[in-house]
C-alpha cells in the first residue's frame, strides 16, 4: 500500500499562447483538477477505468478576470492531491490530469463544469523516490507540477511489497528483517536454505528454513492437517509452538467515522460509510459536485454537505463510491480449466491444451488436418493427437519404420514373428499363450486361464 | 467497416466436394473466432465448427465431423470450408460469422451467405 | 447438447404494438445467449449478447431480458421493419445452438 501524491505549481498560458482567459464574461470562476492512475504497461484505452485510483483536489480561490488585463497563470486549489493505492506500486503508469473550470454565476441547476485542459503521460516510477517535475501543454495552456509515490509503512520497496516494522514491534514476518530505527528501508533477509518454500518458509540464520504455523517439512512444503494456532501472527512461542499475537494492520482500527476494517495480505481495507472515503475513511463533506464517485460512478442526491449521495456504479466496479474493482473472474467463466484474466475493459480465458472459444468451451478436434502415414488412424484426445500406426510403423505421424518384435512382447524364450494381421509368438516347450505367458502343467492343461479350445502347447500364439 | 464476404453460389453433382470461401476485411482476422453455419431451407440456423485464425485450432460439431473440413489462411484473411461427400441433404445456404475472443463475446457478424444446390 | 425451444413459429402484430418472443433452454445457461434478427433473402444480424445488452446501432425498442433457461425478446412500438424471423441462440456451450425461429407477421 501506499500514496501518489501531486502537487500542482502553476496552471496558465503557455509561452507564446494567449488564451483567453477562463474566466472572460463568465463571472466568477474557481479552478478544480482531477487526476487519475492506470497502470501502464500496456496501452489502455483512453476510457479504461483509473485501476490505481483517481482524486479531486480542493476548488480554488474565486477569481473573476480584470477586463483588458493579460491572462495570468490561475489561482490554484491548496494542498497535494493523494491518490492511494492498496496493491504494489506498478512502476510504469499512465497519469492523466484535468484541469475542470467551475462556474459560480446564476446558472440555472447550480454551478456549470467544463474541461479545461487534459493531458496525459506514461511514466516510469520508483515509490519512494524523490519529487519528479514536469511541465505540459494542452492546447494553448502550460501545467506545471511535481509527483511522488511513496508507501506507507509496513510496506516498503520500489514497489511497496516488502513488508517492515520499526525495530520496536515485534519481530518481523516471514524472510523480513526488523527495519532500523527510523528507517524505511528492510534489512537484506538472510539467504535460507536452498528451496525453503518463499511462501510458507523463512529463516533468521543463513542456511536455516524454519515453518510458518500450518506447515512442515524440511522445506516447509508439506501442510499440517491441524493446528490450534492458524490465523494467528507473530513470532513463534518456544513453550506452546504456536504463533503469539503480534500487531495487526487492523488493531486500533485505522478508519475514521466509523469505517470498519478488515484486513488484507500485508494491509488493510476500509469500508466506509456513506458519506465518507479515502483510503481510511477520512474524506468527508462531500457532495455529488465533488466528483465522489470514481471509475465513471454516476452520482445522484447529496446537493449539499449535510445530504447523502449514492454512487451507482458501472458494471465491474463496487463499494460506497464506486472505487472497488469487482473480481469478475470469480463467476469462474472460463470452462474446462481455463484461466481467467481480466484485462480491464474485458475478461479473456487462456485455454488449456485442447480446447478454444471465448470461455473455452470448445473441444478442439485435434485430428483436423492431421494425417497419419502408412495406413496409421488418428486418436484424438486431450489437445494433442495421437497416431495409432499399423504394423511394422511409428513415430508421431506413423512415418518411421519401427520393428514390431523390438519391444519382445514374448515370454519366457518364445520367438517373435511379424506377421501381416499380427504379432505371433511361437513358444518355447512348456508354455502357451498370446504372449506365451501361461505355463504348461504336466498333465497337457496350462495353469489358470485354460488355453483356447484346439491350441498345442508349440503352436504360433497370435498376438492381439 | 466490419465486411465478410463469401464466395457466390455453387451448383454440384451429388458425390464429390465443394469449397467455398469468407474473405474478412475491417478487423484483425487473427483476433476473432470465425464460425460456419447452415441454414436448410425454411429452416432453422445449425452450429458447423468454428476455426481460430491466431493458432489454426478448430473445433466441430460431432454431426458434422467428416462432412466439413474448416481451414484459414491468414496472409489472404480468409476462412475456408470444404464440403465432401454431398449429398441432397448438404443444399442448404451456408455462412461465415465471427466472433470476439472475450469471454462476453457472441457472434456478432455474418457473411452473405453462400447457396449451395446438390443436385443431379 | 442444449436444445433451444421457440416455441411460437409465428406471432402476428400491428405497427405500434408490443410483443414478445420466448425462447428456452434445456438447461441453464446463465445470461449466455443472444438473439439474432433475419429478414427475408438477407443473413442474420445480432441484436442482443449476454441476454440483455443490445449491440449499438440497434434500435433501443429491442429488449432482452431472462436468465438460466428463460429468455425473452421484446419490441416495444413495433416498426414495419422488424418484420423478420427471430432467432435466439446459446453460446455457453459446445456446440452451439439455435432456436428454431420466430416470425414476425406484421
Known amino acids: 500500500a501506499g500514496v501518489f501524491e501531486l502537487q500542482i505549481h502553476s496552471f496558465g498560458p503557455g509561452p507564446g499562447g494567449a488564451p483567453r482567459s477562463p474566466y472572460s464574461a463568465r463571472g466568477p470562476c474557481r479552478l478544480f483538477f482531477r487526476v487519475c492512475l492506470k497502470p501502464g504497461l500496456s496501452e489502455e484505452a483512453a476510457e479504461s477505468p483509473c485501476a490505481l485510483g483517481a482524486a479531486l483536489s480542493a476548488r480554488g480561490p474565486v477569481y473573476t478576470e480584470q477586463p483588458e488585463a493579460p491572462a495570468p497563470d490561475l489561482p490554484l486549489p491548496n494542498g497535494l492531491l493523494q491518490v492511494p493505492f492498496r496493491d504494489a506500486w506498478p512502476g510504469t503508469f499512465s497519469l492523466i490530469i484535468e484541469t475542470w473550470r467551475e462556474e459560480l454565476g446564476d446558472q440555472i441547476g447550480g454551478p456549470a463544469w467544463s474541461l479545461l485542459a487534459r493531458v496525459t503521460r506514461r511514466r516510469r516510477l520508483a515509490a519512494g523516490g524523490p519529487w519528479a517535475g514536469d511541465i505540459q501543454r494542452a492546447g494553448a495552456w502550460e501545467l506545471r507540477f511535481s509527483y511522488r509515490a511513496r508507501c506507507e509503512l509496513p510496506a516498503v520497496g520500489t514497489a511497496c511489497t516488502r513488508l517492515c516494522r520499526p525495530r520496536s514491534a515485534s519481530r518481523c514476518g516471514p524472510g523480513l528483517r526488523p527495519c532500523a530505527p527510523l528507517e524505511d528501508e528492510c534489512e537484506a533477509p538472510p539467504v535460507c536454505r536452498a528451496g525453503c518454500s518463499l511462501e510458507h518458509g523463512f529463516c533468521e540464520q543463513p542456511g536455516e528454513c524454519r515453518c510458518l504455523e500450518g506447515w512442515t517439512g524440511p522445506l516447509c512444503m508439506v501442510p499440517v492437517s491441524t493446528s490450534s494456532c492458524l490465523g494467528l501472527r507473530g513470532p513463534s512461542s518456544t513453550t506452546t509452538g504456536c504463533l503469539v499475537p503480534g500487531p495487526g494492520p487492523c488493531d486500533g482500527n485505522p478508519c475514521a467515522n466509523g469505517g470498519s476494517c478488515s484486513e488484507t495480505p500485508g494491509s488493510f481495507e476500509c469500508t466506509c460509510p456513506r458519506g465518507f472515503y479515502g483510503l481510511r475513511c477520512e474524506v468527508s463533506g462531500v457532495t455529488c459536485a465533488d466528483g465522489p464517485c470514481f471509475n465513471g460512478g454516476l452520482c445522484v442526491g447529496g446537493a449539499d454537505p449535510d445530504s447523502a449521495y449514492i454512487c451507482h456504479c458501472p458494471p465491474g466496479f463496487q463499494g460506497s463510491n464506486c472505487e472497488k474493482r469487482v473480481d469478475r473472474c470469480s463467476l469462474q467463466p472460463c470452462r474446462n480449466g481455463g484461466l481467467c484474466l481480466d484485462l480491464g475493459h474485458a475478461l479473456r480465458c487462456r485455454c488449456r491444451a485442447g480446447f478454444a472459444g471465448p470461455r473455452c468451451e470448445h473441444d478442439l478436434n485435434d485430428c483436423a488436418g492431421r494425417a497419419c502415414a502408412n495406413g496409421g488412424t488418428c486418436v484424438e484426445g486431450g489437445g494433442a493427437h495421437r497416431c495409432s500406426c499399423a504394423l511394422g510403423f511409428g513415430g508421431r505421424d506413423c512415418r518411421e519404420r519401427a520393428d514390431p518384435c523390438a519391444a519382445r512382447p514374448c515370454a519366457h524364450g518364445g520367438r517373435c514373428y511379424a506377421h501381416f494381421s499380427g504379432l505371433v509368438c511361437a513358444c518355447a516347450p512348456g508354455y502357451m499363450g498370446a504372449r506365451c505367458e501361461f505355463p504348461v502343467h504336466p498333465d497337457g492343461v496350462s495353469a489358470l486361464p485354460a488355453a483356447p479350445p484346439g491350441l498345442r502347447p508349440g503352436d504360433p500364439q497370435r498376438y492381439p | 467497416e466490419v465486411h465478410l464476404q463469401q464466395s457466390g453460389p455453387v451448383l454440384v453433382k451429388p458425390g464429390p466436394s465443394v469449397k467455398i470461401s469468407c474473405k474478412a476485411s475491417?478487423?484483425?482476422?487473427?483476433?476473432?473466432?470465425m464460425h460456419w453455419v447452415k441454414q436448410s431451407h425454411g429452416k432453422s440456423l445449425e452450429w458447423i465448427g468454428l476455426?481460430?485464425?491466431?493458432?489454426?485450432?478448430?473445433s466441430y460439431n460431432q454431426k458434422f465431423k467428416g462432412k466439413a473440413t474448416l481451414t484459414v489462411d491468414t496472409s489472404s484473411s480468409t476462412a475456408y470450408m470444404e464440403l465432401n461427400s454431398l449429398t441432397s441433404e448438404d443444399s442448404a445456404v451456408y455462412y461465415c460469422?465471427?466472433?470476439?475472443?472475450?469471454?462476453?463475446?457472441?457472434?456478432?457478424?455474418w457473411g452473405q451467405g453462400t447457396s449451395v444446390t446438390v443436385s443431379s | 447438447d442444449i436444445v433451444m425451444t421457440q416455441s411460437q413459429k409465428f406471432m402476428s402484430t400491428s405497427v405500434g404494438d408490443r410483443v414478445s418472443i420466448s425462447c428456452k433452454a434445456s438447461?441453464?445457461?446463465?445470461?449466455?445467449i443472444a438473439w439474432y434478427q433475419q429478414k427475408p433473402g438477407q443473413s442474420p444480424k445480432a441484436l442482443i449478447y449476454l441476454a440483455s445488452y443490445r449491440y449499438s446501432g440497434v434500435p433501443d425498442r429491442f429488449t432482452g431480458s431472462g436468465s438460466g433457461t428463460d429468455f425473452t425478446l421484446t419490441i416495444n412500438n413495433v416498426q414495419s421493419e422488424d418484420l423478420a424471423e427471430y432467432f435466439c441462440q446459446q453460446y455457453s456451450d459446445s456446440p452451439y445452438t439455435f432456436g428454431s425461429g420466430t416470425k414476425l407477421e406484421i
Open positions: 460469422a465471427r466472433q470476439g475472443n472475450y469471454v462476453n463475446n457472441a457472434i456478432d457478424y
Open positions: 438447461q441453464n445457461v446463465g445470461n449466455i
Open positions: 475491417g478487423f484483425t482476422f487473427t483476433d476473432y473466432y
Open positions: 476455426v481460430y485464425p491466431y493458432n489454426g485450432d478448430i
